[in-house]
C-alpha cells in the first residue's frame, strides 16, 4: 500500500491545506490527510495513541475499498472477518469462524461440516468404493497346489475418502475359505516357500481340513473319489522324496 501523509504548505483555513504531499488532496498538520486524490483510498493509520489520515492505493487486510463520487475510503470488514469483498461478503474469516457463502459462522449449517484446514463449511463427503474385483485364486500359504482347502480373497478400491462427518468406508478386503481338486505341485510350482521350509509332520491334533466358512460359495464336502487311503498317501510320500528333497509336507 502506498501511503501518503499530509503536510501543510499553504494555509487555506485554520489547520487545512491543499498543498499536500503525495496522495492527499487536503491535509492538516494535526490530522494528516483529510481527503485523497482520485482513485486513492482514505484510511486512518494508528501511530502510537494517535490516528492520522493516510491515502492508499489499496486497502489493508481487514478493510475493503468503498467508492462514492470523488470519495474513496477503506471500510472495515465485519468483526469476524479477516478479508472481505464488501461489508456483506467475507472471503476469509477470523480464527474460530467458518466461511459459508460469504458469511462467517461459529458452526456450519445442517448438511455441511467444518474444514479446519481451509476454515470453510464444506459439503459432507461420504465414502465411495468400486465394485469388487474378481476372487483371487484359491491359495494356501501362498501356494495354489498341494492342498485341498485354502482361502481366496477379493478387493475393491476406495474411490472417494469420506470427510470427517461422512459415512465410513466399508471393508475393502474379503476373504473366504475355498476347496480345490487336490493336485500335486509340479516342480516349477514349488517356489521359494517350499524349498526354504523344512519338511515337517502335522502337529498332533492339527486338522488337515479347514473349517468351512459360512460365507464360502463353494461346498466344502469331499467327494468319495477325492479320498485317498493311508497306504496311497505313504506311497506318494516316498515317491515325492525320491523326486525332490525340497518338498514340504502339505498341510
Amino acid at each position: 500500500q502506498n501511503a501518503s501523509r499530509g503536510r501543510r504548505q499553504r494555509r487555506m483555513h485554520p489547520n487545512v491545506s491543499q498543498g499536500c504531499q503525495g496522495g492527499c488532496a487536503t491535509c492538516s498538520d494535526y490530522n494528516g490527510c483529510l481527503s485523497c486524490k482520485p482513485r486513492l483510498f482514505f484510511a486512518l493509520e494508528r501511530i502510537g495513541m494517535k490516528q492520522i489520515g493516510v491515502c492508499l492505493s489499496s486497502c489493508p487486510s481487514g478493510y475493503y475499498g468503498t467508492r462514492y463520487p470523488d470519495i474513496n475510503k477503506c471500510t472495515k470488514c465485519k468483526a469476524d472477518c479477516d478479508t472481505c469483498f464488501n461489508k456483506n461478503f467475507c472471503t476469509k474469516c477470523k480464527s474460530g469462524f467458518y466461511l459459508h457463502l460469504g458469511k462467517c459462522l461459529d458452526n456450519c449449517p445442517e448438511g455441511l461440516e467444518a474444514n479446519n484446514h481451509t476454515m470453510e463449511c464444506v459439503s459432507i463427503v461420504h465414502c465411495e468404493v468400486s465394485e469388487w474385483n474378481p476372487w483371487s485364486p484359491c491359495t494356501k500359504k501362498g501356494k495354489t497346489c498341494g492342498f485341498k482347502r485354502g482361502t481366496e480373497t477379493r478387493v475393491r478400491e476406495i474411490i472417494q475418502h469420506p470427510s470427517a462427518k461422512g459415512n465410513l468406508c466399508p471393508p475393502t478386503n474379503e476373504t473366504r475359505k475355498c476347496t480345490v481338486q487336490r493336485k500335486k505341485c509340479q516342480k516349477g510350482e514349488r517356489g521359494k516357500k517350499g524349498r526354504e521350509r523344512k519338511r515337517k509332520k502335522p502337529n498332533k491334533g492339527e486338522s488337515k481340513e479347514a473349517i468351512p466358512d459360512s460365507k464360502s460359495l463353494e461346498s466344502s464336502k469331499e467327494i468319495p473319489e477325492q479320498r485317498e487311503n493311508k497306504q496311497q498317501q505313504k506311497k506318494r510320500k516316498v515317491q515325492d522324496k525320491q523326486k525332490s528333497v525340497s518338498v514340504s509336507t502339505v498341510h
Partner: antibody
Framework: EVQLVESGPGLVKPSETLSLTCTVS????????WNWIRQPPGKGLEYMGY???????YQNPSLKSRITISRDTSKNQYSLKLSSVTAADTAVYYC?????????????WGQGTLVTVSS | DIQMTQSPSSLSASVGDRVTITCKAS??????LSWFQQKPGKAPKTLIY???RLVDGVPSRFSGSGSGQDYTLTISSLQPEDFATYYC?????????FGQGTKVEIK
C-alpha cells in the same frame, strides 16, 4: 471566514419542485464537498446528499428519484431541487461544507432556510 | 443503512454536572463519528469528529470516546450555554445518518 447562505422560496405547493441555492463565500466550491441536510420542525437531522469539487453528486437513496444537486462555479453556488414534494418535505434546509474523512464533517453550515409545503 | 440509536432522548441536569450521552451504531463504524450541538433556531455546530477530536474553539469540557459500535459524548462540567440538543452522526459509509438527538435541559 467561510460563509454559506441558503436562499429560495419559503413556500412550495404539494407535487411541485422545491428549489434552493447555497451561495458560498471565503472558499471555492471546486474544492471539497458541498452538502444538503434537512430538519423537519421539532425533529432530527436527515442527510440528503452532496456535490463534489468535480461536480459529481451523491443522493441519499431514500430521496434519489426526486433529488437533483447541481452547481454554478461562476457564481460559486450549488443548488438543490426536490421534485414531487409533499407535506413531509416541510423542513429547515441547511447547506454545509466538509473537507474529507480526516476532518470535521460539516465544519461550516449555512443558517438554514425553512421551506413549507402547503397548498 | 446504518442506524444510530442515541440515548437518552432528554435529560435534566444542573450547572456543574457531568453529563454523558451515548450513541450506538447498528454496526462497527470504525471511529467515523461526529457530535453536534444545536440551539433552537440555529444551525448545528460541530463539536467533535473522528470520535474524540475537538473542533478548534470548542471548550475542553467536551470530550468524545468510543470504538466499534458504542460512542460517548461527555460534558465534564455543564455550563449554562451547554443547554441544547446534541446529535451524533456516523460517516463510515453513505448515506450518513444522525442519532435522534438528546435534549439537555436545566433541572
Amino acid at each position: 471566514e467561510v460563509q454559506l447562505v441558503e436562499s429560495g422560496p419559503g413556500l412550495v405547493k404539494p407535487s411541485e419542485t422545491l428549489s434552493l441555492t447555497c451561495t458560498v463565500s471565503g472558499d471555492s466550491i471546486t474544492s471539497g464537498y458541498w452538502n444538503w441536510i434537512r430538519q423537519p420542525p421539532g425533529k432530527g437531522l436527515e442527510y440528503m446528499g452532496y456535490i463534489s469539487y468535480s461536480g459529481k453528486t451523491y443522493q441519499n437513496p431514500s430521496l434519489k428519484s426526486r433529488i437533483t444537486i447541481s452547481r454554478d462555479t461562476s457564481k460559486n453556488q450549488y443548488s438543490l431541487k426536490l421534485s414531487s414534494v409533499t407535506a413531509a418535505d416541510t423542513a429547515v434546509y441547511y447547506c454545509a461544507r466538509y473537507y474529507g474523512y480526516g476532518g470535521p464533517w460539516f465544519a461550516y453550515w449555512g443558517q438554514g432556510t425553512l421551506v413549507t409545503v402547503s397548498s | 443503512d446504518i442506524q444510530m440509536t442515541q440515548s437518552p432522548s432528554s435529560l435534566s441536569a444542573s450547572v456543574g454536572d457531568r453529563v454523558t450521552i451515548t450513541c450506538k451504531a447498528s454496526q462497527d463504524i470504525d471511529s467515523y463519528l461526529s457530535w453536534f450541538q444545536q440551539k433552537p433556531g440555529k444551525a448545528p455546530k460541530t463539536l467533535i469528529y473522528l470520535t474524540n477530536r475537538l473542533v478548534d474553539g470548542v471548550p475542553s469540557r467536551f470530550s468524545g470516546s468510543g470504538s466499534g459500535q458504542d460512542y460517548t459524548l461527555t460534558i465534564s462540567s455543564l455550563q449554562p450555554e451547554d443547554f441544547a440538543t446534541y446529535y451524533c452522526l456516523h460517516y463510515d459509509e453513505f448515506p450518513l445518518t444522525f442519532g435522534q438527538g438528546t435534549k439537555v435541559e436545566i433541572k
